[in-house]
C-alpha cells in the first residue's frame, strides 16, 4: 500500500458491508485476495469494507481482508487492486429515491454491479436490483480479521501495523455523528416490527450512513423493508 492511502483519512473507521437486496435474497459485495469481486449471501471477511468519502460525492472502497481497492476497468468490470489509481478506483456515489445507493465510475460511467451485465449510469434511471446497494454494519467478530504472521520474536507494534495496515481494526470514533433522530442500532431478533421481518436472515439491521457527514435526509436513510 502506498503511504498516502486515501483511506487513512476516512471519516468513519468502522467496517461495513455493501449488499444488494430483493424481497427475498441479498448478496454482499466481496473482494477476494486474488482481486476477484463477487457476491455472497452473507457477511464474510472478504465483504468487510471501508468506504472513504471524498469531495463531490466520490468514494473510495477497500476490502479490508484482501487489502485491495475496488476498481473498474474500461469495460465496466470491477476488480480489486493493491494499487490505487484515482481514475479507476474512485466512484461517484448517489442515493436513489428508494433509499438505495448506486456507485458508478466517473471515468467509464458504468455502474458497480454484482450482475454480469455492464450498464452505464444515466441520471433518473432505475437500475436493476443487483446494481443497487444497501449498507450494513459489520457483524463478524474482529478476531476473524486478525491473521498474524508467525514470528519467533515477541510481537511488536510494527507487526500490528502489518496485520492492520489501514488501522481499521482498532475502534475509532465517528467524526460526524448521525442525526439524533436516526437510530443506528440494529433491531433485535425479538423485534416484532415489520422492519425486523427478515426471513432469510441476510438483511437484518437498519441502513447506516456509511458516508458520514450528512446531516439532512441523506444522513438518515430509511430501513429497507423486506418480506
Amino acid at each position: 500500500y502506498p503511504n498516502a492511502s486515501p483511506l487513512l483519512g476516512s471519516s468513519w473507521g468502522g467496517l461495513i458491508h455493501l449488499y444488494t437486496a430483493t424481497a427475498r435474497n441479498s448478496y454482499h459485495l466481496q473482494i477476494h485476495k486474488n482481486g476477484h469481486v463477487d457476491g455472497a449471501p452473507h457477511q464474510t471477511i472478504y465483504s468487510a469494507l471501508m468506504i472513504r468519502s471524498e469531495d463531490a460525492g466520490f468514494v473510495v472502497i477497500t476490502g479490508v481482508m484482501s487489502r485491495r481497492y475496488l476498481c473498474m476497468d474500461f469495460r465496466g468490470n470491477i476488480f480489486g487492486s493493491h494499487y490505487f489509481d484515482p481514475e479507476n478506483c474512485r466512484f461517484q456515489h448517489q442515493t436513489l429515491e428508494n433509499g438505495y445507493d448506486v456507485y458508478h465510475s466517473p471515468q467509464y460511467h458504468f455502474l458497480v454491479s454484482l450482475g454480469r451485465a455492464k450498464r452505464a449510469f444515466l441520471p433518473g434511471m432505475n437500475p436493476p436490483p443487483y446494481s443497487q446497494f444497501l449498507s450494513r454494519r459489520n457483524e463478524i467478530p474482529l478476531i476473524h480479521f486478525n491473521t498474524p504472521i508467525p514470528r519467533r520474536h515477541t510481537r511488536s507494534a510494527e507487526d500490528d501495523s502489518e496485520r492492520d495496515p489501514l488501522n481499521v481494526l482498532k475502534p475509532r470514533a465517528r467524526m460526524t455523528p448521525a442525526p439524533a433522530s436516526c437510530s443506528q442500532e440494529l433491531p433485535s431478533a425479538e423485534d416484532n416490527s415489520p422492519m425486523a421481518s427478515d426471513p432469510l436472515g441476510v438483511v437484518r439491521g437498519g441502513r447506516v450512513n456509511t458516508h458520514a457527514g450528512g446531516t439532512g435526509p441523506e444522513g438518515c436513510r430509511p430501513f429497507a423493508k423486506f418480506i
Epitope: T22, A40, A117, M125, P129, L200, G201
Partner: antibody, heavy 117, light 106 residues
Framework: QVQLVQSGAEVKKPGASVKVSCKAS????????MHWVRQAPGQGLEWMGI????????SNAQKFQGRVTMTRDTSTSTVYMELSSLRSEDTAVYYC??????????WGQGTMVTVSS | AIQLTQSPSSLSASVGDRVTITCRAS??????LVWYQQKPGKAPKLLIY???SLESGVPSRFSGSGSGTDFTLTISSLQPEDFATYYC????????FGPGTKVDIK
C-alpha cells in the same frame, strides 16, 4: 463444472409427504442461494421458494406457506425440499436451481413426483 | 406481485424464420429480466440475463432487448434445435415466470 443432481422419481399417496434432494458440486455451496421450481405436466414454471445455504433460512411463495420445508446440509452440499399434505395437483417435476444474482444459471435434472391414490 | 405476460402463447414457424417473442411486466422491472429455453423432458436452460446479455455458450442468433415493462426475445434465424418453449422471468421483486411461449414447426 457446476452440477446439481437430484434424487429419483417418487410416487406418493394423497396426504403423504415427499422429500426431494439436490446435491451441488463444482462450486462453493455456501456462496449461492438455491431455489425450488416446479412444473406440472403441460404447464409452466412455478417458483416455490429459496434457501440461504449458510444460515438455512428460507422464504417460500405464499401458495406453499405451511406445506413446504426447505433444508440444507452444508457438509454434503445438499439442499432438500419437503412438500407435505400432497394432493393430485402437486403432481409435477420439481427442480432445484442455483441463483447467480442475475439469473438461475444452473438447474437440476428434475424429479418427477406423482401423487395418486 | 409483478405479473408477466408473454405473447404469443404459441407460434408455428419454419427453419430460417425470424421469431420474436414478447414479455410484458405489470410494472417496471428495470433490466432484471431473464429468458430460458426448455425442451420436453429437460430442465430450463438460461439464454439471456439482464434483458439483453447473452449467456456464455448460447448461439448469437438469440438476442434480447427491452427495459422497464416491455421485453423481446428474438431468434434471428430459427434452427431445428430451437423448437422449444421459452419463458421469461423477472428478478426485480420475487422470481416470477411468464406463462411461456411454445415454438413449434409449421
Amino acid at each position: 463444472q457446476v452440477q446439481l443432481v437430484q434424487s429419483g422419481a417418487e410416487v406418493k399417496k394423497p396426504g403423504a409427504s415427499v422429500k426431494v434432494s439436490c446435491k451441488a458440486s463444482g462450486y462453493t455451496f455456501t456462496n449461492h442461494y438455491m431455489h425450488w421450481v416446479r412444473q406440472a405436466p403441460g404447464q409452466g414454471l412455478e417458483w416455490m421458494g429459496i434457501i440461504n445455504p449458510i444460515s438455512g433460512s428460507t422464504s417460500n411463495a405464499q401458495k406453499f406457506q405451511g406445506r413446504v420445508t426447505m433444508t440444507r446440509d452444508t457438509s454434503t452440499s445438499t439442499v432438500y425440499m419437503e412438500l407435505s399434505s400432497l394432493r393430485s395437483e402437486d403432481t409435477a417435476v420439481y427442480y432445484c436451481a442455483r441463483d447467480y444474482v442475475d439469473a438461475f444459471d444452473f438447474w437440476g435434472q428434475g424429479t418427477m413426483v406423482t401423487v395418486s391414490s | 406481485a409483478i405479473q408477466l405476460t408473454q405473447s404469443p402463447s404459441s407460434l408455428s414457424a419454419s427453419v430460417g424464420d425470424r421469431v420474436t417473442i414478447t414479455c410484458r411486466a405489470s410494472q417496471g422491472i428495470s433490466s432484471a429480466l431473464v429468458w430460458y429455453q426448455q425442451k420436453p423432458g429437460k430442465a430450463p436452460k438460461l439464454l439471456i440475463y439482464d434483458a439483453s446479455s447473452l449467456e456464455s455458450g448460447v448461439p448469437s442468433r438469440f438476442s434480447g432487448s427491452g427495459s422497464g415493462t416491455d421485453f423481446t426475445l428474438t431468434i434471428s434465424s430459427l434452427q431445428p434445435e430451437d423448437f422449444a418453449t421459452y419463458y421469461c422471468q423477472q428478478l426485480y421483486d420475487d422470481f416470477d415466470f411468464g406463462p411461456g411461449t411454445k415454438v413449434d414447426i409449421k
